[in-house]
């Protein structure tokens, strides 16, 4: 069964600065990566980013980098001052279209006691069948 | 099939504003992020800027900050451009399209004459 | 800003002839975490707007002929017309999807003897 697994980290040197990274773990080919925060995509939750694997990368505010890693990996970096300013507290998900799995999407957020530069190491979330 | 219906052309005087919409109905998610292109000479294209729905957040070309504001009314579908302090330089055809171009608008063709 | 250089700017071919013309960036469009280069090829018939033919480099848009093919890597580029067609009268234009802004090339006008 294909996992997603999601990883959030608070950078030391910019407080409001974070580090989104997100994996797929499964065989299929990746159609299509969707960063959202707020909740699921699709279900209140706010895009930050798009990604294609052939198509391009796109963001938008507070996102300021997306980028993929490798070829299941992508990393997204946040920063932002005021409304539109990421908190401790807030669910950041990713949503991965594959072949011919379907869609999956998992969702996390800064482990509650970790200091600025640390985080949780990347474990799949609960993931969401979206079809 | 994804449709992206924008308005009729527009003759418009030196110095005023005008604002172009793109009404797109579509069955993905990424149907509804709109890029705006414009078209001079019939000839260059110049990516103006992309909308996301979700929040109005907005990318712009550098070349068209101040020229160009982009909206988003997310409950009817439409993206909107507005174009101000219009010059004979903003005559073109602009192009709205989906994220990674591959549904475009028919064009609206903007006139600036005294 | 990337800027992306087509040449040459207009060609003039007979029906069933091979054309390839070329595209080359200012900067390199691969993307390094995944291996793939962002850029796109477009055809533009007269009073119509751009039609995406080609994406990833090499990647046919679906519906588009197999008489299209898109090649190269990082700064260099070309697009082939294996056996040109009547219906292929058009200008094509190459575009930087790697880097906001997403910039044009200045169009290859593809006329038909």
């Known amino acids: 069964t294909p996992e997603v697994w999601v990883q959030v980290r608070m950078e030391a040197t910019e407080l409001s600065s974070f580090t989104i990274r997100c994996g797929f773990l499964g065989s299929g080919s990746i159609s299509l990566v969707t960063v959202s925060w707020g909740g699921p995509n699709g279900a209140g939750g706010t895009t930050l980013a798009v990604l294609h694997p052939e198509r391009g990368i796109r963001q938008w505010a507070p996102a300021r980098q997306a980028r993929w890693e490798t070829q299941s990996s992508i990393s997204l970096i946040l920063e932002g001052s005021g409304a539109s300013s990421p908190c401790a507290n807030t669910t950041f998900c990713c949503k991965f279209a594959s072949f011919p799995e379907g869609s999956w999407e998992a969702c996390g957020s800064l482990p509650p006691s970790s200091d600025p530069g640390l985080s949780a190491p990347p474990t799949p979330a609960p993931i969401l069948r979206a079809d | 099939e994804v449709q992206l219906q924008q308005s009729g052309p527009e003759v418009v005087k030196p110095g005023a504003s005008v604002k172009i919409s793109c009404k797109a109905s579509g069955n993905t998610l990424t149907d509804y992020f709109i890029n705006w292109v414009k078209q001079s000479h019939g000839k260059n294209l110049e990516w103006i800027g992309d909308?996301?729905?979700?929040?109005?957040?907005?990318n712009y070309n550098q070349k068209f900050k101040g020229k160009a504001t982009l909206t988003v009314d997310k409950s009817s579908g439409t993206a909107f451009m507005g174009l101000r302090s219009l010059t004979s330089e903003d005559s073109a055809v602009y192009y709205c399209?989906?994220?990674?171009?591959?549904?475009w608008g028919q064009g609206t063709t903007l006139t600036v004459s005294s | 800003d990337i800027v992306m250089t087509q040449s040459p700017s207009s060609l003039s071919v007979s029906t069933g002839e091979k054309v390839t013309m070329s595209c080359r960036s200012s900067?390199?469009?691969?993307?390094?975490?995944?291996?793939?280069?962002?850029l796109a090829w477009y055809q533009q018939k007269p009073g119509q707007p751009p039609k995406l033919l080609i994406y990833g480099a090499s990647t046919r848009e679906s519906g588009v002929p197999d008489r299209f093919t898109g090649s190269g890597s990082g700064t260099d580029f070309t697009l082939t017309i294996s056996s040109v067609q009547a219906e292929d009268l058009a200008i094509y234009y190459c575009?930087?999807?790697?880097?906001?802004?997403?910039?044009f090339g200045g169009g290859t006008r593809l006329e038909i003897k």
């Open positions: 575009q930087n999807a790697h880097t906001s802004p997403y910039t």
């Open positions: 900067q390199s469009l691969l993307n390094s975490g995944n291996q793939k280069n962002y």
């Open positions: 909308i996301n729905p979700d929040n109005g957040a907005g």
């Open positions: 399209a989906t994220l990674y171009f591959d549904y």
